[in-house]
Interface confidence: low
Amino acid sequence: QPSVSPGEPSPPSIHPGKSDLIVRVGDEIRLLCTDPGFVKWTFEILDETNENKQNEWITEKAEATNTGKYTCTNKHGLSNSIYVFVRDPAKLFLVDRSLYGKEDNDTLVRCPLTDPEVTNYSLKGCQGKPLPKDLRFIPDPKAGIMIKSVKRAYHRLCLHCSVDQEGKSVLSEKFILKVRPAFKAVPVVSVSKASYLLREGEEFTVTCTIKDVSSSVYSTWKRENSQTKLQEKYNSWHHGDFNYERQATLTISSARVNDSGVFMCYANNTFGSANVTTTLEVVDKGFINIFPMINTTVFVNDGENVDLIVEYEAFPKPEHQQWIYMNRTFTDKWEDYPKSENESNIRYVSELHLTRLKGTEGGTYTFLVSNSDVNAAIAFNVYVNTKPEILTYDRLVNGMLQCVAAGFPEPTIDWYFCPGTEQRCSASVLPVDVQTLNSSGPPFGKLVVQSSIDSSAFKHNGTVECKAYNDVGKTSAYFNFAFKGNNKEQIHPHTLFTP
């Protein structure tokens, strides 16, 4: 019994004075607690607790279920205990079959023994199946068998407590281990759409999917920069043992402009938190914004192709698109398609394919688009660059040689004189008069230039070259001079050609 210093409270003393007591089933259990300040006896086994206010605990006919820890406590809160085993060959184990283990933690298979002298107290798999190779356990006859560091793979494991009695193996009732998974990663959250664009009065509904190993994951919808509680509805499923899914749906039945903002689906577990956001933009009316993908002033060479391309944002969806030139609508040569197949896409592309353009096909090409709320348009000014064409080359009554050329950009005309019959002309001749004429074609058509020289300056046989050129190319025409005596016998133009 404990020795006591005078004046200092001491724990009660118990008779018999042992830490463990073994009795046979049917025998009497008599325990005496001696203490001037006796308060109570307490009996504990598994989840069962009993109390007794008498200082002597008597059980006349002991049963296996009287196995357990008997504790005497005094008024100072000091206590002393004795553990009693009631040996019953027919009931070697007391069991509490509920068996839950938290992953990576230890868990106790509660099968305390009624006889501490049996041997080989251990765990065995059901139906002779072996236990997992990595399962480690520590037996304690008074408490049960502690499984160390529970693994997720042990979930639904069937096992028995086992002892050897008189050379025979005796099994307890079976236990089914239920493993509560540990959170080893943050929840996985995803949202049905990353952004929503609505008109006032339309319904906003967005679903957040939360995936984790168990249903104890927490989730909520929040509005950024707001504490207001949002109305949400839940659905949930268990896909197998450690695969839990929850869907949290947020709905605003009639969205307003001031509902616009960022909504966050937030989830957390003991490992950490995750979130995903969706952006809601509510507009009072639809819109269309057009963005040209090429310069709206286009220069293209004669005979070449050009694609007029626009991107545009349209909300609601575009209903009518058309390309127009000179008040005529294109029925083909163009295509219109969404920029992405994403259901929240509001960006579209329209392309007009102009092929082998002629000089007469310059002008304003207009793209028009409309939806239920607005119309929009963008114009492209297309200039077709053309090599100069010499339209007329005449000797005038007043003795002038006149050369008229058309092209785009505006051609320049130079004059050259070639002695004899050569057509390699080098001596340049200054024009007397140069004019840019008004073209009768469209405003984006060719520009016409007229240049004149005084032919009286030429005294010898030869050829006069009119050379018209611009950025695209050059074209020449020639006049031949033949003198008979003092008179110019012939002045006639050659066939036009480009050397």
Partner: antibody
Framework: QVQLVESWGGVAQPGRSLRLSCAAS????????MHWVRQAPGKGLEWVAV????????YYADSVKGRFTISRDNSKNTLYLQMNSLRAEDTAVYYC???????????????WGQGTLVTVSS | SSELTQDPAVSVALGQTVRITCQGD??????ASWYQQKPEQAPVLVIY???SRPSGIPDRFSGSSSGNTASLTITGAQAEDEADYYC????????????FGGGTKLTVL
């Protein structure tokens, strides 16, 4: 139609603070960047600050950086300019102005408020 | 910070054409927009982009650009066009901040 109405300005002593607000209506406020521009008496226009459509980005002229704060409350369709450590040279008519192109922060300003006079004087 | 330079004052006879210019490095990269401001009133956008007019702005106002110079042209100036005109563009130093010219006072004689 678009309307921008600035709050009454007022008089403040140097070193003190003043807060301007601008109430917007007639357009989707939360879709457009908003600017503050000021004009000292008899002087030209000076760009002061801009906030992006969602208020997540702010930019300031060097002359006010660190002293002025632009902010917005999209739920109230209101733009603010918090002016701290005021100086005499901050005396001006302050205009709030709307960016022309949806979602673009630095763009042309298509609508302006009527302006409010802020006087900084001891 | 980059600057936009305008002539302080320009005058034009009623009905004549006047050109107000604005110079600055940023105009090599960006178009200028133009604002009209009458006494005791807020500025009004009159030209933006290459040569675009907001609705309600008369077609006598036009804009053009060449090199580091932007121009606002009023063809057939009216008495009501008398005002201060400010050009505005982005800062070319990479900050994208808005920069105003010093303003031009237009007098219609």
């Amino acid at each position: 139609q678009v309307q921008l109405v600035e709050s009454w300005g007022g008089v403040a002593q140097p070193g003190r603070s003043l807060r301007l607000s601008c109430a917007a209506s007639g357009f989707t406020f939360s879709s457009f960047a908003m600017h503050w521009v000021r004009q000292a008496p008899g002087k030209g226009l000076e760009w002061v600050a801009v906030t992006s459509y969602d208020g997540s980005n702010e930019y300031y002229a060097d002359s006010v950086k660190g002293r002025f704060t632009i902010s917005r409350d999209n739920s109230k369709n209101t733009l603010y300019l918090q002016m701290n450590s005021l100086r005499a040279e901050d005396t001006a008519v302050y205009y709030c102005a709307k960016a022309m192109v949806r979602g673009v922060t630095f763009g042309d300003l298509d609508y302006w408020g009527q302006g409010t006079l802020v006087t900084v004087s001891s | 910070s980059s600057e936009l330079t305008q002539d302080p004052a320009v005058s034009v006879a009623l009905g004549q054409t006047v050109r107000i210019t604005c110079q600055g490095d940023s105009l090599r990269s960006y178009y200028a927009s133009w604002y009209q401001q009458k006494p005791e009133q807020a500025p009004v956008l009159v030209i933006y982009g290459e040569n675009s007019r907001p609705s309600g702005i008369p077609d006598r106002f036009s804009g053009s650009s060449s090199g580091n110079t932007a121009s606002l042209t009023i063809t057939g100036a009216q008495a009501e066009d008398e005002a201060d005109y400010y050009c505005n563009s982005r800062d070319s130093s990479g900050t994208h901040l808005r920069v105003f010219g010093g303003g031009t006072k237009l007098t219609v004689l």
